[in-house]
């Protein structure tokens, strides 16, 4: 009896230009014998429904269509038909399909492969046109995918430490999306500092399908209205 | 930094088992296979056997296969090497060490070594 | 099993000097187009070291007076001027089948 198991779930989720391994497991009842079985990769594309051979290995031989595609012949010898993929680009996701022959029996397993990059966040305050008092912080994310993405602000005072979502005076700008299929969005939060209390912290938080936490940047407001000590890698005003 | 480190020197009686651990750092665990491998006093190099953190597939030197148990724990990036039914033949140094699987097969990083002790 | 055979199993060397080692294998190591023969130093009282694999690939951070050449069964580690630091054993080993295995080793020393 010969299977195939793929990564559970059917989804395999990676970051932009990551070295991604997809996991592909062969349970065979024998040893296997490399030199006669034969395995072979193939992609279809989220946008077309056409698939598309990646990369071959048979007996004594290996092909690679895509470049640097490969299975490794070391890792095969003890079930692991995993493709490494170097460098892996947003139109790379999709279906792959691992398909193994030890004749004369077959088996074959699929996997979507979600490609995701991880927004850049960075805090700046922008005072050209703003009146007395009035400063406009903006919250800058860029190099992002896929599209959909939350940008809160929060703040928090000596008198309530738990932080508060912000929801009035907060104008989130359109996704641009980039040359290379990433994007950016730029969410802006309009301040009256001499209604807030010095000391109060204010946080921009971005979440994104590629964070396993969401990414904060925050400022605190001071007497001499503004400082900027973000936590993350963001400009820094004084 | 990559880097392999190995559990300390072991003094065992013949006849029983001894279990190597090998603590991974610095690179993707996964993305490596594991090798054994020993030197007795004196003597060359000789390899055990290695593994895949992937899915814990094993190859195994034939002259130790039924002796030898390489597993893994993924969780905290450790491989360990379990030989029993100890024979002083066995007293060497034990080496783990990182090997790469895709590009070539080669040993790139090395634990410092655990050395092994077989005496009644 | 592979066999492999390496000459000299010793070698006394004058700093500044060339050094050659040579490891013959059984049968070969060859698979695909490529070379599965990898080279190993081992200082004294120190695991093995990666010198150069696929036979002729410098590892990162070893000296380029080191080269290896070859193919098939025969292959050659070449060390262009000896200095005091490459004393130890040198090992080739295959990869190419199962058991790996290395050679018996070549002691080099400094005279």
């Known amino acids: 009896d010969l299977k195939v198991e793929m990564m559970a779930g059917g989804t395999q989720i990676t970051p932009l230009n990551d070295n991604v391994t997809i996991f592909c497991n062969i349970f065979y009842s024998q040893p296997l014998n490399i030199t006669s079985m034969g395995i072979t990769w193939f992609w279809k594309s989220l946008t077309f429904d056409k698939e598309v051979k990646v990369f071959e290995f048979f007996g004594d031989h290996q092909e690679a269509f895509r470049p640097g595609a490969i299975v490794s012949p070391w890792r095969l010898k003890s079930g692991d038909a995993s493709l490494r993929l170097p460098g892996i680009q947003l139109e790379e996701a999709g279906e792959y399909r691992c398909e193994v022959v030890v004749t004369p029996l077959k088996a074959q397993g699929t996997v979507q492969l979600e490609v995701v990059a991880s927004p850049a966040s960075r805090l700046l305050l922008d005072q050209v046109g703003m009146k007395e008092n009035e400063d406009k912080y903006m919250c800058e994310s860029s190099g992002f995918y896929p599209e959909a993405i939350n940008i809160t602000w929060e703040k928090q005072t000596q008198k309530f430490p738990h932080p508060i979502e912000i929801s009035e005076d907060v104008i989130t700008g359109p996704t641009i999306k980039n040359m290379d299929g990433t994007f950016n969005v730029t969410s802006c939060l309009k301040l009256n500092s001499s209604q807030e209390d010095p000391g109060t912290v204010y946080q921009c938080v971005v979440r994104h399908a590629s964070l396993h936490t969401p990414l904060r940047s925050n400022f605190t407001l001071t007497a001499a209205r503004h400082s900027l000590s973000e936590t993350e890698k963001t400009d820094n005003f004084s | 930094e990559v880097q392999l480190v190995q559990s300390g020197a072991e003094v065992k009686k013949p006849g029983a088992s001894v279990k190597v651990s090998c603590k991974a750092s610095?690179?993707?665990?996964?993305?490596?296979?594991m090798d054994w491998v020993r030197q007795a006093p004196g003597q060359g190099l000789e390899w055990i056997g290695d593994?895949?953190?992937?899915?814990?597939?094993?190859l195994y030197n034939q002259k130790f296969r039924g002796r030898v148990t390489l597993t893994v724990d993924t969780s905290i990036s450790t491989a360990y090497m379990e030989l029993s039914r100890l024979r002083s033949d066995d007293t060497a140094v034990y080496y783990c060490?990182?090997?790469?699987?895709?590009?070539?097969?080669?040993?790139?990083?090395w634990g410092q070594g655990t050395t092994v002790t077989v005496s009644s | 099993d592979i066999v492999l055979t390496q000459t000299p199993l010793s070698l006394s060397v004058t700093p500044g000097q060339p050094a050659s080692i040579s490891c013959k294998a059984s049968q070969s190591v060859d698979y695909d187009g490529d070379s599965y023969m990898n080279w190993y130093l081992q200082k004294p009282g120190q695991p093995p070291q990666l010198l150069i694999y696929?036979?002729?690939t410098l590892h990162s951070g070893v000296p380029d007076r080191f080269s290896g050449s070859g193919s098939g069964t025969d292959f050659t580690l070449k060390i262009s001027r000896v200095e005091a630091e490459d004393v130890g054993v040198y090992y080739c080993q295959q990869s190419k089948e199962d058991p790996r295995t290395f050679g018996q080793g070549t002691k080099l020393e400094i005279k």
């Open positions: 696929a036979a002729s």
């Open positions: 060490a990182r090997s790469e699987v895709f590009y070539g097969n080669y040993a790139d990083y």
């Open positions: 610095g690179y993707t665990f996964t993305d490596y296979n």
């Open positions: 593994i895949n953190p992937n899915n814990g597939g094993t």
